[in-house]
Amino acid sequence: QPPPPPPDATCHQVRSFFQRLQPGLKWVPETPVPGSDLQVCLPKGPTCCSRKMEEKYQLTARLNMEQLLQSASMELKFLIIQNAAVFQEAFEIVVRHAKNYTNAMFKNNYPSLTPQAFEFVGEFFTDVSLYILGSDINVDDMVNELFDSLFPVIYTQLMNPGLPDSALDINECLRGARRDLKVFGNFPKLIMTQVSKSLQVTRIFLQALNLGIEVINTTDHLKFSKDCGRMLTRMWYCSYCQGLMMVKPCGGYCNVVMQGCMAGVVEIDKYWREYILSLEELVNGMYRIYDMENVLLGLFSTIHDSIQYVQKNAGKLTTTIGKLCAHSQQRQYRSAYYPEDLFIDKKVLKVAHVEHEETLSSRRRELIQKLKSFISFYSALPGYICSHSPVAENDTLCWNGQELVERYSQKAARNGMKNQFNLHELKMKGPEPVVSQIIDKLKHINQLLRTMSMPKGRVLDKNLDEEGFESGDCGDDEDECIGGSGDGMIKVKNQLRFLAELAYDLDVDDAPGNSQQATPKDNEISTFHNLGNVHSPLK
């Protein structure tokens, strides 16, 4: 039987609706027309649509779809962007405090070394920061350079303070002797192992977060195909051509269309799931020597121990070096005056005991829990978008792309669409090139995360004792002792409580040798304001 004529025989409602999309009415017929030129909203009778209107509907449908997609990912995108920024800044703050602790240790214990030691320590921690941010620096080289630089100063200032100026040309030989004679024992290797493991994990953690942002940004800005535009137009706008302004698309029909449009995007799902689970595995392994906070904030203590090791063997070393470096090659000795305060940046912090203590590690776990709630994000996208766009409840009295139906039947809808274009074909085209690229990047980061993760990959799990070191860990109880003994040493109770709004309630007694109190810069605190309901100790 022929379809009922449009309720509005003058296309008046259609005209007023279309005016909102496109000012001016030149494209809208005043009364229903045959519509033989239509390509999407194929009429079964007179229609209030023209070819130009159809094109406008297609454009609008694709824009709507892009907006829906962006709003669907907004929460997830914000979660990752915010955390990537927070962690990056927190890591930089850890590095700065580690540098301050180390400088303060030198100032307290070895004041005669400070000018040069501050310089070498500064260079080392600058390299640490650069490495975390992805710079192509070798961690072993960084550690070697630190100790190569320190030893000539230790030798000439501590072990042989009476050396005549003419003897200062042995610098290059002393640098070489540092390794050849193993003057610091196994401490440099211990530091290499701990620093490289913890920084590797930190770096890949940040890389993974930044890739997460890239994934969302990519899918956020996808341009949908013309085929998809036609399907969306048929679902959202073709009913208007028949004057059915208030009719909503059938829910089942919406799901079919969205799955067609999203076929490429949904292919990300498998790799996205793996990404979140691999990231969780990595985070679960970020403790002790895999936790840069723990490792870097304890470095000052290990460096102190290494210098004590040199001092303990000073007698034998001095004789051996006399033999090794007699008449050695000359090298200009870089001596410069460094003001005492130049390298301690007066923000050595007290460990804050806060009611709701929040460490970097708890913040990481919290992030993973939130990310896990988005594990089905991509597979759920079609359903999400349908639930956030107007669809008829229970699939009753709804639009199936061709007509108003009492109940939606997927089979009937598919049959009706066959002559227009093939849904199956749309799915088989495969993902967009940008989606393929992002899938490749996800595969790569997943591979890296798997390699780094401790339970499976075991790349990072060599026990230090195996490598001939004293492990230096103080047992498995909650309080990790990462400070050493001796003057100016501190114990950091269960790591720094950074994220308690970066509690810089400075107390000189708790810091290794800082002589002034300081207030943090405002911007260092503001980044962390949204990190949880924490009672800040800041006055």
Epitope: A177, R179, T320, K323, A326, S328
Partner: antibody, heavy 120, light 107 residues
Framework: QVQLVQSGADVRKPGASVKVSCKAS????????ISWVRQAPGQGLEWLGW????????NYAQKFQGRVTMATDTSTSTAYMELRSLRSDDTAIYYC?????????????WGQGTLVTVSS | QSVLTQPPSVSVAPGKTARITCGGN??????VHWYQQKPGQAPVLVVY???DRPSGIPERFSGSNSGNTATLTISRVEAGDEADYYC??????????FGTGTKVTVL
């Protein structure tokens, strides 16, 4: 690339002397010491001594003190090792080797070896 | 006078791991270097400063050093790894000392 090229094989009578040369290329000759190491047929490696091309400073193994002399010519980037009062048990392949850092360093590049045969 | 003791020979199947030890009094306090020597060739440095690898040496070669024993480990052994291996240290009393050497045979 770093290369150490040694002089050819030599046959000497007991009591005589032998002088082996080692020409270096591919790096700054003065900035690395040169060690001499020998290996008797079917035996292990034995260190003879070290010389700094920069200073001419030498360090000889106790066993060879008084019998060995090492020298360098920086203008030709060549090191020399002379062994005197040769005995039949000095028959060996003699290698020059570059020290990585100081006298106490490992040897990161080696010459191809020079066979010295001591026979009456 | 330092003495470095190595096992005379080690046999290993291809793809397996070979471990060569070098024993010496308190060797852990010294830097140990390892050389590979194939018949008719000069030695080649494969590991230095206990565990560092020169460029061009495969990651399969690794070293460790602790207490009175240093170890050269060759993982996923290949036929081309068949050679003599020597450890070496320097100490102030006896200068450079080489180990007795170990012949590695790939089965």
């Amino acid at each position: 690339q770093v290369q150490l090229v040694q002089s050819g094989a030599d046959v000497r009578k007991p009591g005589a002397s032998v002088k082996v040369s080692c020409k270096a290329s591919g790096y700054t000759f003065a900035s690395h010491g040169i060690s001499w190491v020998r290996q008797a047929p079917g035996q292990g490696l034995e260190w003879l001594g070290w010389i700094s091309p920069y200073t001419g400073n030498t360090n000889y193994a106790q066993k060879f003190q008084g019998r060995v002399t090492m020298a360098t010519d920086t203008s030709t980037s060549t090191a020399y090792m002379e062994l005197r009062s040769l005995r039949s048990d000095d028959t060996a392949i003699y290698y020059c080797a570059r020290g990585k850092r100081t006298l106490a360093s490992c040897f990161d590049y080696w010459g191809q070896g020079t066979l010295v045969t001591v026979s009456s | 006078q330092s003495v470095l003791t190595q096992p005379p020979s080690v046999s290993v199947a291809p793809g397996k791991t070979a471990r060569i030890t070098c024993g010496g009094n308190n060797i852990g306090s010294k830097s140990v270097h390892w050389y590979q020597q194939k018949p008719g060739q000069a030695p080649v440095l494969v590991v230095y400063d206990d565990s560092d690898r020169p460029s061009g040496i495969p990651e399969r070669f690794s070293g460790s050093n602790s207490g009175n024993t240093a170890t050269l480990t060759i993982s996923r052994v290949e036929a081309g790894d068949e050679a003599d291996y020597y450890c070496q240290v320097w100490d102030s009393s006896s200068d450079h000392v080489f180990g007795t050497g170990t012949k590695v045979t790939v089965l």
